[in-house]
């Protein structure tokens, strides 16, 4: 059997670190057998059988010029084997970042903090942290460790499914190469890393007859559980075209009627989501959607409740049917869309200028 331990990595390759002494091992001889060493394709003897180093070649302070293929020969001239030297560094602790787009699963990505230059793999696992007392920590089979399954497509990512929202987890990512291993431990709580995906299906529509209004509607992100135990809250921003500052509102549900749009101008609208109890952080903004307030007169019929108040309402309708102003007005439209439920009383508007 070969006297050379097989390092993790491709066969026939041995490894060392730049600036350090490197020992190469002749694979096809018995341990201690004296051999001669040559660079592949070069007749010059690097180290003879009388070196006293047996089956090993020692390179002091290896550098990049020492990388390449070496040949060892036994005393009778037979080939003892070929060895390729590759230089690089032992692993440094990888950098690990975890994120959750919902409250049941989370994923962790990693990156080397230094490129070793050697074949590298990663071992990923996690365990649930169970704390008994203030300073004591109990480990039991129910707390792991369990493997964190890695992305089958080879991305530097693993996913923990079925995580518990209120639990703490310790992620272990170990970088392994032929010169060693290095581990990063990262403590994670789903509550702190929760960041929903942005809301989907954002639509912005005019409200016929209301030149200062736009109705925006959207849906939960597809990644959020369909029967959620935890709801999302939303933040909506809007601005007229060519206007640099966004106005911000926090809608109560999945739609919002903007009551202070600039008549005649297209408006950009975007929405963001967050856990309704403020766990984690706000999502990124959705792609912007655009809409322009209506310019025509009110087309809707008078609501049912108005019967018996016809004379009083005729004046109101006549006023609302008057043509939209010729130039945009920056004053809010004071008229409620639904006379029974004035929108202006429901929401706080924050204007960022």
């Amino acid at each position: 059997s070969s006297p050379c331990p097989q390092a993790w990595g491709p066969p026939g390759v041995q490894y060392g670190q730049p600036g350090r002494s490197v020992k190469l091992c002749c694979p096809g001889v018995t341990a201690g057998d004296p051999v001669s060493w040559f660079r592949d394709g070069e007749p010059k003897l690097l180290q003879g059988p009388d070196s006293g180093l047996g089956h090993e070649l020692v390179l002091a302070q290896a550098d990049s010029t020492d990388e390449g293929t070496y040949i060892c020969q036994t005393l009778d001239g037979a080939l003892g084997g070929t060895v390729t030297l590759q230089l690089g560094y032992p692993p440094a602790r990888p950098v690990v970042s975890c994120q959750a787009a919902d409250y049941e699963n989370f994923s962790c990505t990693w990156s080397p903090s230094q490129i070793s230059g050697l074949p590298t793999r990663y071992l990923t696992s996690y365990r649930k942290k169970t704390v008994l007392g203030a300073d004591s920590q109990r480990r039991s089979p129910s707390t792991g460790p369990w493997p964190c399954p890695q992305d089958p497509l080879g991305a530097a990512r693993c996913v923990v499914h079925g995580a518990e929202f209120w639990s703490q987890y310790r992620i272990n990512v170990t970088e392994v190469n032929p010169l060693g291993a290095s581990t990063r431990l990262l403590d994670v709580s789903l509550q702190s890393i929760l960041r929903p995906d942005p809301p989907q299906g954002l639509r912005v529509e005019s409200v016929p007859g209301y030149p200062r209004r736009l109705r925006a509607s959207w849906t939960y992100p597809a990644s959020w559980p369909s029967q959620p135990h935890f709801l999302l809250k939303f933040r909506l921003q809007y601005r007229p075209a060519q206007h640099p500052a966004w106005s911000t509102v926090e809608p109560a549900g999945l739609e919002e009627v903007i009551t202070d749009a600039v008549a005649g101008l297209p408006h950009a609208v975007r929405v963001s989501a967050r856990d309704f109890l403020d766990a984690g952080t706000w999502s990124t903004w959705s792609p912007e959607a655009w809409g322009t307030p209506s310019t025509g007169p009110l087309q809707d019929e008078i609501p049912d409740w108005s019967q018996g108040h016809g004379q009083q309402l005729e004046a109101v309708v006549a006023q609302e049917d008057s043509p939209a102003p010729a130039r945009p007005s920056l004053q809010p439209d004071p008229r409620p869309l639904d006379h029974r439920d004035p929108l202006e009383q429901h929401h706080h508007h924050h204007h960022h200028h």
């Epitope: 440094a92 950098v95 970042s97 990156s111 903090s113 230094q114 490129i115 290095s182 990262l186």
Partner: antibody, heavy 118, light 107 residues
Framework: EVQLLESGGGLVQPGGSLRLSCAAS????????MGWVRQAPGKGLEWVSS????????IYADSVKGRFTISRDNSKNTLYLQMNSLRAEDTAVYYC???????????WGQGTLVTVSS | DIQMTQSPSSLSASVGDRVTITCQAS??????LNWYLHKPGKAPKLLIY???NLQTGVPSRFSGSGSGTDFTFTITSLQPEDFGTYYC?????????FGPGTTVDIK
């Protein structure tokens, strides 16, 4: 010999923006994690931000998160710090630093002064 | 985030004196600790890494010890070029943090 040279500092008004650069030489820039550390006048050192060799993961101090963006161009051997919404308390000498073998900030530049004042 | 404390905040010493600075972390940081010397107008210089390893080219009068939460930095015989501010720094987490510094000046 590792060399890090910062530039881009100067006087900026509160709310303004500035982009710092760090030109690296003497080592294979694309293999190393890099970062920024600052020192406010009369204060101690404060870590600001770090970026992995590929640029794929960035990390920020809470005091700058959402306002500062670290990035790198490995083809130009250059590290950047984009600073937006600057505040008076961001006034400091900003140092570029290299990590080595998992050890943070083994090598430093000479620093560039950023002054935020009206 | 991990808080680092250092003591003393300043000290006056003479050339040849033995100087000791302590650093404490708010939680266990294993041995992920650096010691730096910073002089005005200069770049900070790494002296000790991994709590006790001497950085290449740093004189052997500097040493460090400790693990967990308590660390010590020692200069066995203070030299004129050693005056300045010394900082400890933890890098156990992805958010490194520095101690407040210890200023060493001439008595």
């Amino acid at each position: 010999e590792v060399q890090l040279l910062e530039s881009g500092g100067g006087l900026v008004q509160p709310g303004g923006s500035l982009r710092l650069s760090c030109a690296a030489s003497g080592f294979t820039f694309s293999r190393y994690m890099m970062g920024w550390v600052r020192q406010a006048p009369g204060k101690g050192l404060e870590w600001v931000s770090s970026i992995v060799p590929s640029g794929g993961i960035t990390i920020y101090a809470d005091s700058v998160k959402g306002r500062f963006t670290i990035s790198r161009d490995n083809s130009k051997n250059t590290l950047y710090l984009q600073m937006n919404s600057l505040r008076a308390e961001d006034t400091a000498v900003y140092y570029c630093a290299r990590d080595h073998m998992g050890i943070v900030a083994t090598d430093w530049g000479q620093g560039t002064l950023v002054t935020v004042s009206s | 985030d991990i808080q680092m404390t250092q003591s003393p905040s300043s000290l006056s010493a003479s050339v040849g004196d033995r100087v000791t600075i302590t650093c404490q972390a708010s939680q266990d940081i294993t041995n992920y600790l650096n010691w730096y010397l910073h002089k005005p107008g200069k770049a900070p210089k790494l002296l000790i890494y991994d709590a006790s390893n001497l950085q290449t080219g740093v004189p052997s009068r500097f040493s460090g010890s400790g693990s967990g939460t308590d660390f010590t930095f020692t200069i066995t015989s203070l030299q004129p070029e050693d005056f300045g501010t010394y900082y400890c720094q933890q890098y156990d987490t992805l958010h490194p943090s520095f101690g407040p510094g210890t200023t060493v000046d001439i008595k």
